[in-house]
């Protein structure tokens, strides 16, 4: 029987009778908040094999083992995470051991197993046998391991029944309990199951089966389940459902769950039922079950119930995230703000339609109307009085309203209004009435000629560049000396450089009238040599980076005809050299055989160029004899390291005062003193682990039904 | 794979309220769908009488809404009807069933409540 | 509320002669999504119901092709074009575009 969508059994041990004829769990399975100690002995459940999502416990009062609880469940597959975790098992006060001795498989995700006072037999289960990669999994905070004495079955008896693995380059036997070793199939199956007895199983089944190869057989399915058999994709006319089954179309069309009660209804695409259309897909038709896809962003309207949205904040304008099309008026008011530009066009850059007018007014803090990327028509459908669709008044530092070189933006009906903005060119709004289709629709009064642009160098002249040269962090550049009909108005040059991946960059991405910029910006003095050309050094930049560059001439405000002339040059775009690599990343071996190692790694965060080969060196150790003088097998304590790796728990370097002087044989040295690196890495690890504190807290404490 | 189970008495008393327990398997009433009860008088046709919704909101069949309550006990993963002041008509056979976005997709077997002193 | 009326309320059919169940609702039944949430039930001696056509014309996944589904507005019919002896009960069609939701009166199929 499929249970689902997700269990939650808290408060009452006796909830557990829900899991009675479950034989998967479609969702998740939280077992937690169950404060009175109970025997839980009477309370099995062997029907249950598989739980689809994640597995959490936590405070679960009296519960000693899982073993008996779950003796059958062999997989979690992890389909959707508990902050990134497919297995949870926190501050569980009474839990000895984990003991789900048939957990054979978590398919996606890693484990998390933190602050459980009483929690042994971590050490000696080999989680690489059970997830793809270990190195997320988190075992913090339990029973030290050598106040556990954990030990395999047989192991007192020097009959060991487990089979053993190398785990840190410690080879040792592998299990779950006392009595309960860790099942590993036999190397002839390689990534395949195997029965109890060692057969191998079919390729389509996942962690385990009742009979060999036999894909009817199967305990989990290693792709879908379909019709009792294990198949590696969903027959015709059915459907992919929660990353483990196939179901029919009706199945999907009738699906209504809490989580997408909101939308249309679940629709089938590229052969999978889901709850929406994924990114960049749109349903074909309001209730339709089949997605189509988006011609550039998909489409979401936005409406304002009060006609008019006001735009004062980063908060407003967060309202507005995600929308192409805003049916009503947008007022645009930002009189100052933070790192505005960039936080506007997050939230704004994707409007492409507003139906009634826009109106920017008193936004003392914009400096460019580019965060509205992606706006292309406004309908003027309402129109402010006198008929207008686009007002633009008293913007003391907008000097730019969009690149028209590479914008198509139409006013459909209504007037433009500009008045009062001293830094916008008139030229400016003259190319906008060309872009828009609105020439010819404003009167004289319409676009003032005298206080739009006052106080701007309106009249540009072009600077050239005439020399570029880079290396793996630097770049040189020379432009030509700029000569302004009075040469004495030239005061100096500022170059303004930026990455940029792409060669789409714009003179005001980014920039607001409050200090917030992305260019970076340095001032070039005049050379004191008519004849030498101006130019700049720009070091301390990452190799292999597309960098965009431009400079400007700084001019004294010289009025000629009632406008200021100025120069700047074309957006250059210049790649510095490539360099080393950084170091690889997550290097992890293990070895698969006598003879065999493996090796995986990352690629390196900073490949600085375009990676061609990697380089594999390896040497052989020395074995370390310090490993066969103890019988590890006796339950006596483990002799202590007569060294320290500066890692210890602090509430462990109790042992040894501060006064033992280190090395010879005069016994355990101190831990040395925590380099700056191990402490932020400390600081960090703390951090992290109330990160998910709180994300668990805030997600299972919920009000109580009604 | 779910199931549901309709309980309770099969004989009431006339103007005596008539107590109905479904119990599901296989499915959290709380994870969706709308979670319904319907009767059929003998030799008679359905008769859809209301529904409690995953999330506990309650629709009713207006004719019925002065006697009928629908409710949960979310930890039992049960939902109840109640109707109160009956008479031999509403002699049925009361089914649960789940609704979806579109139709009932899984129904009890019936259980037959007789009004009669 | 909306009443739905089926007829016939019953239909001796002959095994492999086609059969076809009328019903009309007393307004329309298109929801405000514009979708049509009308549906065909049967219900076999002794069982609870079983659903046969979702969404005026959709037949359920395993229903044999035999059964179609027609309609729009207020007028729905279920056509079965052979009669097999195992189609023998009463047939119900529902609406829940509007509360509350209503079911006809029922066709009761039977073999001549």
């Known amino acids: 029987e499929i249970c689902g969508p997700g269990i939650d059994i808290r408060n009452d041990y006796q909830q557990l009778k829900r899991l009675e004829n479950c034989t998967v769990i479609e969702g998740y399975l939280h077992i937690l908040l169950i404060s009175k100690a109970e025997d839980y002995r009477s309370y099995r459940f062997p029907k249950l094999t598989v739980i689809t999502e994640y597995l959490l416990l936590f405070r679960v009062a009296g519960l000693e083992s899982l073993g008996d609880l779950f003796p059958n469940l062999t997989v979690i597959r992890g389909w959707k995470l508990f902050y990134n975790y497919a297995l949870v098992i926190f501050e569980m006060t009474n839990l000895k051991d984990i003991g789900l001795y048939n957990l054979r498989n978590i398919t996606r995700g890693a484990i998390r197993i933190e602050k459980n006072a009483d929690l042994c037999y971590l050490s000696t289960v080999d989680w690489s046998l059970i997830l793809d990669a270990v190195s997320n999994n988190y075992i913090v905070g339990n029973k030290p391991p050598k106040e556990c004495g954990d030990l395999c079955p047989g192991t007192m008896e020097e009959k060991p029944m487990c089979e053993k693995t190398t785990i840190n380059n410690e080879y040792n036997y592998r299990c779950w309990t006392t009595n309960r070793c860790q099942k590993m199939c036999p190397s002839t199956c390689g990534k395949r199951a195997c029965t109890e007895n060692n057969e191998c199983c079919h390729p389509e089944c996942l962690g385990s089966c009742s009979a060999p190869d036999n894909d009817t057989a199967c305990v989990a399915c290693r792709h879908y389940y379909y019709a009792g058999v294990c198949v590696p994709a969903c027959p015709p006319n059915t459907y992919r459902f929660e990353g483990w089954r196939c179901v029919d179309r009706d199945f999907c069309a009738n699906i209504l769950s809490a989580e997408s009660s909101d939308s249309e209804g679940f629709v089938i695409h590229d052969g999978e039922c889901m709850q929406e259309c994924p990114s960049g897909f749109i349903r074909n038709g309001s209730q339709s079950m089949y997605c189509i896809p988006c011609e550039g962003p998909c489409p979401k309207v936005c409406e304002e119930e009060k006609k008019t949205k006001t735009i004062d904040s980063v908060t407003s304008a967060q309202m507005l995230q995600g929308c192409t099309i805003f049916k009503g008026n947008l007022l645009i008011n930002i009189r100052r703000g933070n790192n505005i530009a960039s936080e506007l066009e997050n939230f704004m850059g994707l409007i492409e339609v507003v139906t009634g007018y826009v109106k920017i007014r008193h936004s003392h803090a914009l400096v460019s109307l580019s965060f509205l990327k992606n706006l292309r028509l406004i309908l003027g459908e309402e129109q402010l009085e006198g008929n207008y669709s686009f007002y633009v008044l008293d913007n003391q530092n907008l000097q730019q309203l969009w690149d028209w070189d590479h914008r198509n933006l139409t006013i459909k009906a209504g007037k433009m209004y500009f008045a009062f903005n001293p830094k916008l060119c008139v030229s400016e709004i003259y190319r906008m009435e060309e872009v828009t289709g609105t020439k010819g629709r404003q009167s004289k009064g319409d676009i003032n000629t005298r206080n739009n642009g006052e106080r701007a160098s309106c009249e540009s002249d072009v600077l050239h560049f005439t020399s570029t040269t880079t290396s793996k962090n630097r770049i040189i550049i020379t432009w030509h000396r700029y000569r302004p009909p009075d040469y004495r108005d030239l005061i100096s040059f500022t170059v303004y450089y930026k990455e940029a991946p792409f060669k789409n960059v714009t003179e005001y991405d980014g920039q607001d009238a409050c200090g917030s910029n992305s260019w970076n910006m340095v001032d070039v003095d005049l050379p004191p040599n008519k004849d030498v050309e101006p130019g700049i050094l720009l070091h301390g930049l990452k190799p292999w980076t597309q960098y965009a560059v431009y400079v400007k001439a700084v001019t004294l405000t010289m009025v000629e005809n009632d406008h200021i002339r100025g120069a700047k040059s074309e957006i250059l775009y210049i790649r510095t050299n490539a360099s080393v690599p950084s170091i690889p990343l997550d290097v992890l071996s293990a070895s698969n055989s006598s003879s065999q190692l493996i090796v995986k790694w990352n690629p390196p965060s900073l490949p600085n160029g375009n990676l061609s080969y990697y380089i594999v060196r390896w040497q052989r150790q020395p074995q370390d004899g310090y490993l066969y003088r103890h019988n590890y097998c006796s339950k006596d304590k483990i002799p202590i390291r007569k060294y320290a790796d500066g890692t210890i728990d602090i509430e462990e370097v109790t042992e040894n005062p501060k006064t033992e002087v280190c090395g010879g044989e005069k016994g355990p040295c101190c831990a040395c003193p925590k380099t700056e690196a191990e402490k932020q890495a400390e600081k960090e690890e703390a951090e992290y682990r109330k990160v998910f504190e709180n994300f668990l807290h805030n997600s299972i404490f919920v009000p109580r039904p009604e | 794979q779910v199931q549901l189970q309709e309980s309770g008495p099969g004989l009431v008393k006339p103007s005596e309220t008539l107590s109905l327990t479904c119990t599901v398997s296989g499915y959290s009433i709380t994870g969706g769908y709308l979670w319904n009860w319907i009767r059929q008088p003998p030799g008679k046709g359905l008769e859809w009488i209301g529904y409690i919704s995953y999330d506990g909101t309650n629709n009713y069949k207006p004719s019925l809404k002065d006697r009928v309550t629908i409710s949960r006990d979310t930890s039992k993963n049960q939902f109840s009807l109640k109707l109160s002041s009956v008479t031999a008509a509403d002699t049925a056979v009361y089914y649960c069933?789940?609704?979806?976005?579109?139709?009932?997709?899984?129904w009890g077997q019936g259980t037959l409540v007789t009004v009669s002193s | 509320d909306i009443v739905m009326t089926q007829s016939p309320l019953s239909l001796p059919v002959t095994p492999g002669e086609p059969a076809s169940i009328s019903c009309r609702s007393s307004q329309s039944i298109v929801h405000s999504n514009g979708n049509t949430y009308h549906q065909w039930y049967l219900q076999k001696p002794g069982q609870s119901p079983q659903l046969l056509i979702y969404?005026?014309?959709n037949r359920l996944y395993g229903v044999p092709d035999r059964f179609s589904g027609s309609g729009s507005g207020t007028d729905f019919t279920l056509k079965i074009s052979r009669v097999e002896a195992e189609d023998v009960g009463v047939y119900y069609c529902f609406q829940g575009s509007h509360v509350p939701w209503t079911f006809g009166q029922g066709t009761k199929v039977e073999i001549k």
């Open positions: 969404k005026v014309s």
């Open positions: 069933a789940r609704y979806g976005r579109v139709f009932f997709d899984y």
